[in-house]
């Protein structure tokens, strides 16, 4: 599965779009800063196998896609940029899905390290609750946008796993 090239290209494009989506100066939102605790240490301390890396990256992108697909998100961002960003994520999901099926085989689903999936889910739970608590304010969305950009950059260890031959 020739994922690394296409994935990193799409990942870069998504990050550029996410950067362009910024509407407010981050300095005007300093009071809204929040520690979301991306599970960086867990990821960095682990040597991911390819199938594991694909599953965890898929979960991260799927949760990001869901987050930016809500009505509240539509109201917060410039529509054409949001659509381009969502399309980019959707394509990444397609790439990763194709790889899961190719790596695993259609019928068989091996055990994966569910704790990493759960760590990603909990991280996005914290983001979701933060947005709700802040009533989806423009500053809250700006904080989340910056956080997602960071998390995309953090997942380098996962991307190393993509290049590994299981």
């Amino acid at each position: 599965c020739d994922l690394p090239q296409t994935h990193s290209l799409r990942n870069r494009r998504a990050l550029i779009l996410l950067a362009q989506m910024g509407r407010i100066s981050p300095f005007s939102c300093l009071k809204d800063r929040h520690e979301f605790r991306f599970p960086e240490e867990e990821f960095d301390g682990h040597q991911f196998q390819k199938t594991q890396a694909i599953s965890v990256l898929h979960e991260m992108i799927q949760q990001t896609f869901n987050l930016f697909s809500t009505e509240d998100s539509s109201a917060a961002w410039e529509q054409s940029l949001l659509e381009k960003f969502s399309t980019e994520l959707y394509q990444q999901l397609n790439d990763l899905e194709a790889c899961v099926i190719q790596e695993v085989g259609v019928e068989e689903t091996p055990l994966m390290n569910e704790d990493f999936i759960l760590a990603v889910r909990k991280y996005f739970q914290r983001i979701t609750l933060y947005l709700m608590e802040k009533k989806y304010s423009p500053c809250a969305w700006e904080v989340v946008r910056a956080e997602i950009m960071r998390s995309f950059s953090f997942s380098t260890n996962l991307k190393k796993g993509l290049r590994r031959k299981d």
């Epitope: 799927q62 869901n66 697909s69 899905e97 099926i101 994966m112 909990k122 914290r126």
Partner: antibody, heavy 119, light 108 residues
Framework: QVQLVQSGAEVKKPGASVKVSCKAS????????MHWVRQAPGQGLEWMGE????????IYAQKFQGRVTMTRDTSTSTVYMELSSLRSEDTAVYYC????????????WGQGTLVTVSS | EIVLTQSPATLSLSPGERATLSCSAG???????LYWYQQKPGQAPRLLIY???NLASGIPARFSGSGSGTDFTLTISSLEPEDFAVYYC?????????FGQGTKLEIK
């Protein structure tokens, strides 16, 4: 609106297998993990496992590992839960419940499917 | 496995009274991942409270939740006839996800 519609009641003999379906509508099927929870008569709720409809990966509770198989058909937005080597203790109502985050976690449930295991 | 123990098993109260239901976890649960469900006979469970203290959509304000770590509480300030049901706490803080055994709230 989100709807989860399950297949009808089943009566099975000990040792047999049962396959329960859960058809989803009203949302993008591939975007949310689907869970299975069961409830024996007069008893509490028990989580069995979950499936990601997008690529089919599963996570099962240790208790059901080796006996349960969760699958999905993206063309019909349906997930399936198959339980094999049935015994009388497996008599229960089986529910599918959609995952999500915040207020969406298990906010949507199927109506339940009664599986009776009896000789 | 995180065992959730609910108490009391049965609570007999009259409409208008205050109900306090407890859920004790065998090990610490992140408050973000502690939920409460209500179930009536012949029905699927219904989400009441998410993340310990947040009311789900359409749930009346007489319901409230609190707690942290290993001890969580569901409170119904003034019971209405439709509140008599079984209540379950649930955690998805670690695998396998678990539910309490339930508290049956019955009319005295």
């Amino acid at each position: 609106q989100v709807q989860l519609v399950q297949s009808g009641a089943e009566v099975k003999k000990p040792g047999a297998s049962v396959k329960v379906s859960c058809k989803a509508s009203g949302y993008t099927f591939r975007n949310y993990w689907m869970h299975w929870v069961r409830q024996a008569p007069g008893q509490g709720l028990e989580w069995m496992g979950e499936i990601n409809p997008s690529h089919g990966r599963t996570i099962y509770a240790q208790k059901f590992q080796g006996r349960v198989t969760m699958t999905r058909d993206t063309s019909t937005s349906t997930v399936y839960m198959e339980l094999s080597s049935l015994r009388s203790e497996d008599t229960a109502v089986y529910y599918c419940a959609r995952g999500g985050l915040g207020p969406a976690w298990f906010a949507y449930w199927g109506q339940g499917t009664l599986v009776t295991v009896s000789s | 496995e995180i065992v959730l123990t609910q108490s009391p098993a049965t609570l007999s109260l009259s409409p208008g009274e205050r109900a306090t239901l407890s859920c004790s976890a065998g090990s610490s649960v992140d408050s973000s991942e502690l939920y409460w469900y209500q179930q009536k006979p012949g029905q699927a469970p219904r989400l009441l409270i998410y993340s310990t203290s947040n009311l789900a959509s359409g749930i009346p304000a007489r319901f409230s939740g609190s707690g942290s770590g290993t001890d969580f509480t569901l409170t119904i300030s003034s019971l209405e006839p439709e509140d008599f049901a079984v209540y379950y706490c649930h955690q998805w803080s670690s695998y396998p996800f678990t539910f309490g055994q339930g508290t049956k709230l019955e009319i005295k």
